[in-house]
Every structure is written in C-alpha cells, then in structure tokens.
Interface confidence: medium
C-alpha cells in the first residue's frame, strides 16, 4: 500500500493538510514530541503559582514547578499547595503543629508517627521532635560484654504523603 | 470591598521594636497570602517578608533576624515586628494581599509612615 | 538575590504616546515578574503578573512581554491617569525583589 506522507513528518512539525499534506514547523507556542502528527500541541503556561521550570519546544513541552511558598502536587506538576514549617501539616484550617509523638522533617506531607523503638529490641537513644524522628540506640544484648559491634539505627521510612484540599483554592 | 489597612505608631525610637498591624477586610484569609513591602521616603519598594494563609512566613535574609510576621484571624489581623530599629528603618510600610492562585500582590493597604528618631 | 535593573529610571511623554520600560534581572526568573503601578502619596497597583498577564481591571492599553532576563512593560496609548512611577518585581526566588523604578513625566 502506499506509505503515508504524514510518517516522513519529524518530531517539532506537524504533517499540514491545507498545503498538501507538507511538513511545516510547529507554530510559535506548540509543539510535536513525536513525528507523523497532524496537529501541533499547546505548550503549557506555567502562570500564577506555577512558575517555568522548562521552557517550551518545538519538540516539548513546557514544565512548571511552583514559586517560592509552594511546592508541587500531582503528576506534572498539576497543582501547587503552601509549603508548612517542618513540625507541621498542612489542613484544611491552615499549617498545624505536629501532635505529641508525630514528626515531619520537611515542609510538606503530614505528620508520621515516631519510630517504635521497641518493636526492634531497641532503646531510645535521642527523644523524638515535632520535626524529627527518635533515633534508636543499640538493643540491651548488644550492650552486653562481647558485643562485637553497634546495630546502627533503623533507617527512616520514606515520606507518607496525603494532600488536603486548601478552602478557597 | 477588600481592604487592607495599616496601623501603628508613626514614631519610634532607635534600639526599640517597631510593631505594625495590617486589619483586613472583603476577603476569606484562607485564600490568600499577606506580604509586607516598606519604602523609605523618596526610594524604592523593599519586599520584608510574607505569611501564608497556613501559617507559614518566609522573610528577607536582610531583615530576617529582626523581623517577625504572625496573624491573628480570629481578628483578621496581621502583624509586623521589627526590632532594633535605625534611623534607616524610617519608611511607608505596606501590607498587601497575595491570592493562592497567583503570586502577585493584588491589594495594598494605604501604607504608614513610621519614624526612627529619638 | 536577583537584581533588577529598570530603564529608564525617568521619562518624558506626551498624551497618546507608547511608552516602553523595561526591566533586566540579572538570573533567569522564567516569567515570574509583575508590573505595578505608583502615583505620588498612593500605594502601588499591581498590573501585570507573569510577565505578560493583566490583573482584573487593568486597561488593555497596558501589556507586558519577556521572559528569562529581559521583561517589557508597554502603555500604547499613553492616558492623562498614567503619568506615575512603575516597579517590575521577580518572584521567581526568595528574597523577592523589585526593580528600582520608572518614572514617567508629562513633556
């Protein structure tokens, strides 16, 4: 069969069926990621909250994170939501401190509950803040006479992450 | 009708804490940011720090040892603290509104002049 | 911190004349700039954010261009109410800073 002539169009053009089917480049603010297109896509505008992270080509589109007070949400970049202090979370009433016994070490994503020493055989080695986890110390039986060496601490379970929605948004 | 207005002694002495308050109104805090901007007679706009409607505030590195900025909603009251004031401190300080949806100060309050002079 | 450079720092204009200022940052700050607007003994007015964006109620007259260092702010019909001085800002970084401003004069 007969090849169609849209296929030779390459990445950053679209194949245009007003001028016989010709490869032109994609207009100012467009783009085409792949060849063979028939349509030039809008570039994102990173505008308001989301600012540039990279510019719009030919053959890409625009990234967007957020201006500084905010950070990221969503694939791509979708959303951008207040950043809090470490020590808080963010809810629908704005950024709270962490409660008794919960940390969070960065300025977004909840508060996650301290590490459960116990649960590993371990001691507390350094109290728990609202911004940091406790770090645990070496079990009773490794303190004991001929202990070879010191378990080190249990690592920090990776960050739990639950957006809440801001009012007024 | 959004208003924003500032408030506070036109006069302080040098070494002492100047405390401002911004009263809003015609808005829901949720929604918005506060930013203090000052600017001393004759000059420019000099950006002092913001406070986020959730609470959080980030400030100038060149202030950021002497500023303060908190809010009291149940008021709807925002407050500026800048301690061990010089005489080039002597400005018109703003309170302006940032809405969550765009960086961009899109209300002013009238400003106040405050003096730094013994 | 990024600076920002305004020229011209004043200017002279007629009614009915375009007017263009503009503004250089010295770091790329994408398009995260505003324009604002300050008449003597006012606080300022913001009229453009995002570099090219007009704030609700700004007259078409006004626009705003660039991108990365170089930004534009454009009156193309220069009215009797627009003689005042205009500040560029970047919020692209902590601290945000402004440029230090156009004054535009009557001739």
């Known amino acids: 069969g007969l090849q169609d002539p849209c296929s030779n169009c390459p990445a950053g053009t679209f194949c245009d069926n007003n001028r016989n089917q010709i490869c032109s480049p994609c207009p100012p603010n467009s783009f085409s990621s792949a060849g063979g297109q028939r349509t030039c896509d809008i570039c994102r505008q990173c505008k308001g909250v989301f600012r540039t992270r990279k510019e719009c080509s030919s053959t890409s589109n625009a990234e967007c994170d957020c201006t500084p007070g905010f950070h990221c949400l969503g694939a791509g970049c979708s959303m951008c939501e207040q950043d809090c202090k470490q020590g808080q979370e963010l809810t629908k009433k704005g950024c709270k401190d962490c409660c008794f016994g919960t940390f969070n070490d960065q300025k977004r994503g909840i508060c996650r509950p301290w590490t459960n020493c116990s649960l590993d055989g371990k001691s507390v080695l350094v109290n728990g803040t609202k911004e940091r986890d406790v770090v645990c110390g070496p079990s009773p039986a490794d303190l004991s006479p001929g202990a070879s060496s010191v378990t080190p601490p249990a690592p920090a379970r990776e960050p739990g992450h639950s957006p809440q929605d801001i009012e007024g948004r | 009708q959004v208003q924003l207005q500032e408030s506070g002694p036109g006069l302080v002495k040098p070494s002492e804490t100047l405390s401002l308050t911004c009263t809003v109104s015609?808005?829901?805090?949720?929604?918005?940011?506060v930013h203090w901007i000052r600017q001393p007679p004759g000059k420019g706009l000099e950006w002092i720090g913001v406070?986020?409607?959730?609470?959080?505030?980030d400030y100038n590195p060149s202030l950021k040892s002497r500023v303060t900025i908190s809010v009291d909603t149940s008021k709807n009251q925002f407050s500026l603290k800048l301690s061990s004031v010089t005489a080039a401190d002597t400005a018109v300080y703003y309170c302006?509104?940032?809405?969550?949806?765009?960086?961009?100060?899109?209300?002013w309050g009238q400003g106040t002049l405050v003096t730094v002079s013994s | 911190d990024i600076q920002m450079t305004q020229s011209p720092s004043s200017l002279s204009a007629s009614v009915g004349d375009r007017v263009t200022i503009t503004c250089r940052a010295s770091?790329?700050?994408?398009?995260?700039v505003a324009w604002y607007q300050q008449k003597p003994g006012k606080a300022p007015k913001a009229l453009i954010y995002?570099?090219?964006y007009r704030d609700s109620g700004v007259p078409s007259r006004f626009s705003g261009s660039g991108s990365g260092t170089d930004f534009t702010l454009t009156i193309s019909s220069l009215q009797p109410e627009d003689f005042a001085t205009y500040y560029c800002?970047?919020?692209?970084?902590?601290?945000?800073?402004f440029g230090g401003g156009t004054k535009v004069e009557i001739k």
């Open positions: 015609g808005f829901s805090l949720i929604s918005y940011g």
């Open positions: 800002q970047q919020y692209n970084s902590y601290p945000l800073t």
């Open positions: 406070i986020w409607s959730g609470g959080s505030t």
């Open positions: 302006a509104r940032n809405p969550l949806t765009a960086t961009v100060m899109d209300y």
């Open positions: 770091q790329n700050v994408g398009t995260n």
């Open positions: 995002s570099a090219s």
